[in-house]
Interface confidence: low
């Protein structure tokens, strides 16, 4: 038979079977399954005196290997003492030794449940730069436990001082955290939390979750808002990079000008999205004159995992110009909402599509968060239109019943702005057409998508009327749709109605 090292087991009695007045007690150590002879068994009894007796080895019939038992009898304050039996087997190796440390007797105990929780995958299937594994050792009878982390079966050098133990009723729980570098986690290694308790071993293992499909990185470059360009006179352009995996290197955004002239200092912002991806924005201040005169700006996006750089460029929109028409409306009072009113502003037939919308009250611009404005949409002609919605309170209109909807657009003259005033009380609205009777029923659609009739009434749907926005753009009661007749060559009539 080939050389075989022994397996070592502590031999103890059940505590409840030892009389409380016992002055001495015997415990043992079993070394079994070794070949060839001999083994050397020694005991560490701490401060207590003890006598040892090692029984002659016996042969295990089936394997031809050996087994032996060493007994230790101690007297004195043995109940609180731990004892170590050391088994050496020099035929296996000159330094082969196995230590078992245990107390005189074993209590009935509830073994722990071992479970590893991991923080490895985010919503996008990407991995953060560090991964935390949490080993939960729960529901065991209070007592000493040892936690060891293994990587592919090898003991890891882990700081276990962070392990914390809590006791709930008669049972205890312990948790230990392991922080891994992304490299190790992605290497497909198996991590094991191994718990030794009352001479028994309990463990749980984990490895990285299945790979997800890589997501594409997209880049977008915006033009300056007309408000920044013409009113604040401090225009900026923004390069937006989306769907970045946070764990895959740093994205670099570099600005340049087609003319070769230097660019200003840009500011950068990074945000983690709910789906786990990273969004990076870089904002570059540009010169008002440079922009108006047609300078082209380029944003170059490089990233370690992009096969090539992404280039995006932006310049002043070319093509025909048309100033916006601005119409402002107030909704009638709605039952149960006497102290609130909704104002709407239709801005249409402008080109190009870049436009800024503001609301003013008492000659003060209201914060952008106060109003909701749709993205520009194509009209049936060549221009664009937007709707803007503002909720106002009784306190505001009683202070001054005039609200101004202002559009900032490059084709508006003389100062790139067009504005209309609207009052909450009927008959005072600038640019409103509330005196006209609205059709009983209207067929609404958003963009090219034909919708269903949403208003009660018995007449035929108006043939050339469409709604500017669907429910998502017009939250809160009353749900307002402003419709515009698209008849060419006529001044558009407008109405407010409930779809």
């Amino acid at each position: 038979a080939s050389t075989q090292s022994p397996s070592v087991f502590p031999l103890t009695r059940c505590c409840k079977n030892i009389p409380s007045n016992a002055t001495s007690v015997t415990l043992g150590c079993l070394a079994t399954g070794y070949f060839p002879e001999p083994v050397m068994v020694t005991w560490d009894t701490g401060s207590l005196n003890g006598t040892t007796m090692t029984l002659p080895a016996t042969t295990l019939t089936l394997s031809g290997h050996y087994a032996t038992i060493s007994l230790l009898t101690v007297s004195g304050a043995w109940a609180k003492q731990m004892f170590t039996c050391r088994v050496a087997h020099t035929p296996s190796s000159t330094d082969w030794v196995d230590n078992k440390t245990f107390s005189v007797c074993s209590r009935d105990f509830t073994p722990p449940t071992v479970k590893i929780l991991q923080s490895s995958c985010d919503g996008g299937g990407h991995f953060p730069p560090t991964i935390q594994l949490l080993c939960l050792v729960s529901g065991y009878t209070p007592g000493t436990i040892n936690i060891t982390w293994l990587e592919d079966g090898q003991v890891m050098d882990v700081d276990l001082s962070t392990a914390s133990t809590t006791q709930e009723g008669e049972l205890a729980s312990t948790q230990s955290e392991l922080t891994l570098s992304q490299k190790h986690w992605l290497s497909d290694r198996t991590y094991t939390c191994q718990v030794t308790y009352q001479g028994h071993t309990f463990e749980d293992s984990t490895k990285k979750c299945a790979d997800s499909n890589p997501r594409g990185v997209s880049a977008y470059l915006s033009r300056p808002s007309p408000f920044d360009l013409f009113i604040r006179k401090s225009p900026t352009i923004t390069c937006l990079v989306v769907d970045l995996a946070p764990s895959k290197g740093t994205v670099n955004l570099t600005w340049s000008r087609a003319s070769g002239k230097p660019v200003n200092h840009s500011t950068r912002k990074e945000e983690k999205q709910r789906n786990g991806t990273l969004t990076v924005t870089s904002t570059l201040p540009v010169g008002t004159r440079d922009w108006i005169e047609g300078e082209t700006y380029q944003c170059r996006v490089t990233h370690p995992h992009l096969p090539r750089a992404l280039m995006r460029s932006t310049t002043k929109t070319s093509g025909p110009r048309a100033a916006p028409e601005v119409y402002a409306f107030a909704t009638p009072e709605w039952p149960g909402s006497r102290d609130k009113r909704t104002l709407a502003c239709l801005i249409q037939n402008f080109m190009p599509e870049d436009i800024s919308v503001q609301w003013l009250h008492n000659e003060v611009q209201l914060p952008d968060a106060r109003h909701s404005t749709t993205q520009p949409r194509k009209t049936k002609g060549s221009g664009f239109f937007v709707f803007s919605r503002l909720e106002v309170t009784r306190a505001e209109w009683e202070q001054k019943d005039e609200f101004i909807c202002r559009a900032v657009h490059e084709a508006a003259s003389p100062s790139q702005t067009v504005q209309r005033a609207v009052s909450v009380n009927p008959g005072l609205a600038g640019g409103s057409a509330q005196s006209q009777r609205a059709p009983d029923r209207v067929l609404c659609h958003s963009g090219q998508q034909q919708g269903l009739p949403r208003a009660a009434g018995g007449s035929v749907p108006h043939p050339r009327c469409h709604c500017g926005a669907g429910r998502a753009d017009w939250p809160g009661p009353p749900e307002l749709d402003v419709c515009v007749e698209e008849a060419e060559g006529e001044a558009p009539w407008t109405w407010t109605g409930l779809c």
Partner: antibody
């Protein structure tokens, strides 16, 4: 772009504790990267000391484990190095460094020189 | 610890020359090696990661190669601004750096 700036005492007496601060601008330290301390000894040898991750967990060089601590103040976007029981062997330039993917080190501070001397 | 050995403390070269800087790991580190350079009075700057991936914005005259234990950083045509100390770093098990190779003009 992210910028890191180290600040500290410059001179520390042996057996005392060293405290350094790294102030980060242009990026939040609670985002998905790790924030490291690396030092460079006279003679140019570089040693990675440890990091604090975006989530607040730490990892240290085993050779320093018994006397190093890295912490952070997210409200000020700062992270800190504390090294206890310093000796003249700890005389070095200390860099705070941002590491993407925690595999390599992309952005380094300018470094702060620390001398341990009585 | 994994030891990274850069056997040449100094290397002399001329502008326009091709130069190769070597680094040896004390054990297999797969391709988990990065290269940096450090100019006088500055902090190190990342050039190459994962042995051969050029970091964003790094000129293409810098190339990295190797796997296992032997790694090389090659500058195809040395420019005056390339004169610096070059460090390798392994990121296979925690992080350790080589002692550096100083690139000088003949």
């Amino acid at each position: 772009d992210v910028q890191l700036l180290e600040s500290g005492p410059g001179l520390v007496k042996p057996s005392q504790s060293l405290s350094l601060t790294c102030t980060v601008t242009g990026y939040s330290i609670t985002s998905d990267y790790a924030w490291n301390w690396i030092r460079q000894f006279p003679g140019n040898k570089l040693e990675w000391m440890g990091y604090i991750s975006y989530s607040g967990s730490t990892r240290y060089n085993p050779s320093l484990k018994s006397r190093i601590s890295i912490s952070r103040d997210t409200s000020k976007n700062q992270f800190f190095l504390q090294l206890n029981s310093v000796t003249s062997e700890d005389t070095a330039t200390y860099f705070c460094v941002y590491g993407s993917s925690q595999r390599f080190f992309d952005y380094w501070g300018q470094g702060t020189t620390l001398t341990v001397s009585s | 610890d994994i030891l990274m050995t850069q056997s040449h403390k100094f290397m002399s070269t001329s502008i326009g020359d091709r130069v190769s800087i070597t680094c040896k790991a004390s054990q297999d580190v797969s391709i988990d090696v990065a290269w940096y350079h450090q100019k006088p009075g500055q902090s190190p700057k990342l050039l190459i990661y994962s042995a051969s991936f050029r970091y964003a914005g790094v000129p293409d005259r810098f190339t990295g190669s190797g796997s296992g234990t032997d790694f090389t950083l090659t500058i195809s045509s040395v420019q005056a601004e390339d004169l610096a100390v070059y460090y390798c770093q392994q990121h296979y098990s925690l992080f350790t750096f080589g002692s550096g190779t100083k690139l000088e003009i003949k």
